[in-house]
Interface confidence: medium
């Protein structure tokens, strides 16, 4: 995992890392995260609810690291030396929309806002903590 | 106090471009994204599009697409939305806006309402 | 784009009574609507986000509620300052639409 750098001002009233319990975001690279996480949802039951949507998406495999993507928003990767969820970075966001959104649109489904690349820090914006995928996820 | 101070009235002929800025204060600029929204008279709101004043990324209706510019500059805590090739129907009060950052630890990624609005700025246009 | 409705456009109610706004979407926004107040020569005064919020130093005869596409703003006693236009506002998704507004004038 490779990652930016931290805006500590964004970092104030964390809640502790716990596991992550969404079977879509297991083994992929990391096992703790934190609620909320990046879209407001409070419990991880709330997050793998919505995050099921995408779950046909995910397995017709339009992007290889949309899994990843994905995680980093519903189950951001959580350590105790950072204080705020850690989303992925803009680029990986844009291939996951460059190579998915077509078959979002397919069956009548927009990109949501809700995952808009232009939300993501870039990999070296010195505001904020992003994650490139690894390798192997 | 939080507040969003836009510039003056603008009379313009058709053609032209218009350049309105609006100073952010009592608040870090770079944590909330800024919006511009206009209203034609007597008409409802129109979103324009937005500006990430971190980044200075940009999104727009595609209404505006082509037409529109929005800046910012972080010295002074300013945004800037320019709007070219002017016609009279883009005769408005233009409107910056904060978009809310409610919940510090989610910031950025999710979508919000405005909680703070700019005074508006008549533009006119006329030839 | 997502179409907002909002009904009625004009609401004639007296003070003190009770006001019932109604925004249509046209596709769900789960809770990501917004609702605006807007007096004539000023900028619009944000009331109620995520759907049932109260924003910030706004009173309590506001509320909100709705889900999906459907969504109601409520004032449960008109006081004379709450005459004005009321937007509703969606940010589920681009381009971030507002209804055509309903304004609540004195009965």
């Known amino acids: 995992l490779e990652i930016g750098r931290f805006d500590p001002e964004r970092g104030r009233g964390a809640a502790p890392c716990q596991a992550v319990e969404i079977p879509m975001c297991r083994g992929i690279g990391y096992n703790l995260t934190r609620m909320p996480n990046l879209l407001g949802h409070t419990s991880q039951g709330e997050a793998a609810a919505e995050l099921a949507e995408f779950a046909p998406l995910v397995q017709y495999g339009c992007h290889s690291h949309l899994r990843f993507f994905l995680c980093s928003l519903y189950a951001p990767m959580c350590t105790d030396q950072v204080s705020t969820p850690i989303p992925a970075c803009r680029p990986m966001c844009e291939q996951a929309r460059l190579r998915c959104a077509p078959i979002m649109e397919q069956f009548n489904f927009g990109w949501p806002d809700s995952l808009d690349c232009a939300r993501l820090p870039t990999r070296n914006d010195p505001h904020a903590l992003c994650m490139e995928a690894p390798e192997n996820a | 106090q939080v507040q969003l101070v836009q510039s003056g009235a603008e009379v313009k002929k058709p053609g032209a471009s218009v350049k309105v800025s609006c100073k952010a204060s009592?608040?870090?600029?770079?944590?909330?994204?800024m919006h511009w929204v206009r209203q034609a008279p007597g008409q409802g709101l129109e979103w324009m599009g937005w500006?990430?004043?971190?980044?200075?990324?940009?999104k727009f209706a595609p209404k505006f697409q082509g037409r529109v510019t929005m800046t910012r500059d972080t010295s002074t805590s300013t945004v800037y939305m320019e709007l070219s090739s002017l016609r009279s129907e883009d005769t408005a009060v233009y409107y910056c806006?904060?978009?809310?950052?409610?919940?510090?630890?989610?910031?950025?990624?999710?979508?919000?309402?405005?909680?703070?609005w700019g005074q508006g700025t008549t533009v006119t246009v006329s030839s | 784009e997502i179409v907002l409705t909002q009904s009625p456009a004009t609401l004639s109610v007296s003070p003190g009574e009770r006001a019932t706004l109604s925004c249509r979407a046209s596709q769900s926004l789960r809770s990501k609507l917004a609702w605006y107040q807007q007096k004539p020569g000023q900028a619009p005064r944000l009331l109620i986000y995520g759907a049932s919020t109260r924003a910030t130093g706004i009173p309590a005869r506001f509320s909100g509620s709705g889900s999906g596409t459907e969504f109601t703003l409520t004032i449960s006693s008109l006081q004379s300052e709450d005459f004005a236009v009321y937007y509703c506002?969606?940010?589920?998704?681009?381009?971030?639409?507002f209804g055509p507004g309903t304004k609540v004038d004195i009965k």
């Open positions: 506002q969606q940010y589920a998704n681009s381009p971030w639409t």
């Open positions: 806006a904060r978009e809310a950052n409610y919940d510090i630890l989610t910031g950025y990624i999710r979508p919000d309402a405005f909680d703070i």
């Open positions: 500006i990430n004043p971190n980044s200075g990324d940009t």
């Open positions: 009592g608040y870090t600029f770079t944590n909330n994204f």
